[in-house]
Interface confidence: medium
């Protein structure tokens, strides 16, 4: 089937970066400036994306691939292919309709994006709070209160839980 189609359809021979020009006897013509075709056999070239305003050009458009955008400093990408830019906040804040607002007591955000999340409840795991939480950091849970009582067997206490959102260094 593919062989038959290629014999009947001269456009299938046009490579990426060109289009099949019906105005010129279906000759493969290069994509005009500021356009591209990422696959062969196309009858038109697509207009290149322009990274304007809050968008910055991360990768220039070529005849075979679209431009790629990211966001200007102070903003981060949202959506497939960075379709939108959202403003950063400071750690310890979240973005609301009223702009960047501090995390409420009992919540934290250790990133410049996303929402404030509740501190870990250490007691749910039978542990105690080793380090108090802040707006920027989760609490650190330590050994259970029973492990700290006098006469408890001397076992090595477990390592503090890793803070959410952080990968090991």
């Amino acid at each position: 089937f593919e062989r038959t189609r290629s014999l009947q359809d001269p456009c299938s021979n046009c490579p990426a970066g060109t289009f099949c020009d019906n105005n010129r006897n279906q000759i493969c013509s290069p994509c005009p400036p500021n356009s591209f075709s990422s696959a062969g056999g196309q009858r038109t070239c697509d207009i290149c994306r322009q990274c304007k305003g809050v968008f910055r050009t991360r990768k220039e458009c070529s005849s075979t691939s679209n431009a790629e955008c990211d966001c200007t400093p102070g903003f981060h990408c949202l959506g497939a292919g960075c379709s939108m830019c959202e403003q950063d906040c400071k750690q310890g804040q979240e973005l609301t309709k009223k702009g960047c607002k501090d995390c409420c007591f009992g919540t934290f955000n250790d990133q410049k994006r996303g929402i404030c999340r509740p501190w870990t409840n250490c007691s749910l795991d039978g542990k105690s709070v080793l380090v108090n939480g802040t707006k920027e950091r989760d609490v650190v849970c330590g050994p259970s209160p029973a492990d700290l009582s006098p006469g408890a067997s001397s076992v090595t206490p477990p390592a503090p839980a890793r803070e959410p959102g952080h990968s090991p260094q």
Epitope: G53, M84, C85, K97
Partner: nanobody
Framework: EVQLVESGGGLVQPGGSLRLSCAAS????????MIWYRQAPGEELEWVAN????????YYVDSVKGRFTISRDNATNSLFLQMNSLRAEDTAVYYC????????????????WGQGTTVTVSS
């Protein structure tokens, strides 16, 4: 083509007033939140104010509260920023931007921007 075009900038003395306009075309203006941003020389973009689809919700950065007023006219697809009691620190390029169509999923992103209009406050 989706487009935003700002106008109304200029040179004004401290304490003076300006009214910025933003003309929208190519999309259903009344479906979207709209936002004003500004960028002072050598600084990052700063959010100034935003307004919801029907104009019933308006929010401002602290530094302009009581001096700036954001408004919109959905009949003419226009966004406005009335700036009173201007200060030297308000000097910047002001941009209007299209926000979300409901701010769903905590996304406060912008996808369409104007070319900006320059406001200079100087004596």
């Amino acid at each position: 083509e989706v487009q935003l075009v700002e106008s109304g900038g200029g040179l004004v003395q401290p304490g003076g007033s300006l009214r910025l306009s933003c003309a929208a075309s190519g999309f259903t203006f009344s479906d979207y939140w709209m936002i004003w941003y500004r960028q002072a020389p050598g600084e990052e973009l700063e959010w100034v104010a935003n307004i919801n689809q029907d104009g019933s919700e308006k929010y401002y950065v602290d530094s302009v509260k009581g001096r700036f007023t954001i408004s919109r006219d959905n009949a003419t697809n226009s966004l406005f920023l009335q700036m009173n009691s201007l200060r030297a620190e308000d000097t910047a390029v002001y941009y209007c931007a299209r926000g979300g169509d409901g701010y769903s999923n905590s996304h406060y992103g912008m996808d369409v921007w104007g070319q900006g209009t320059t406001v200079t406050v100087s004596s």
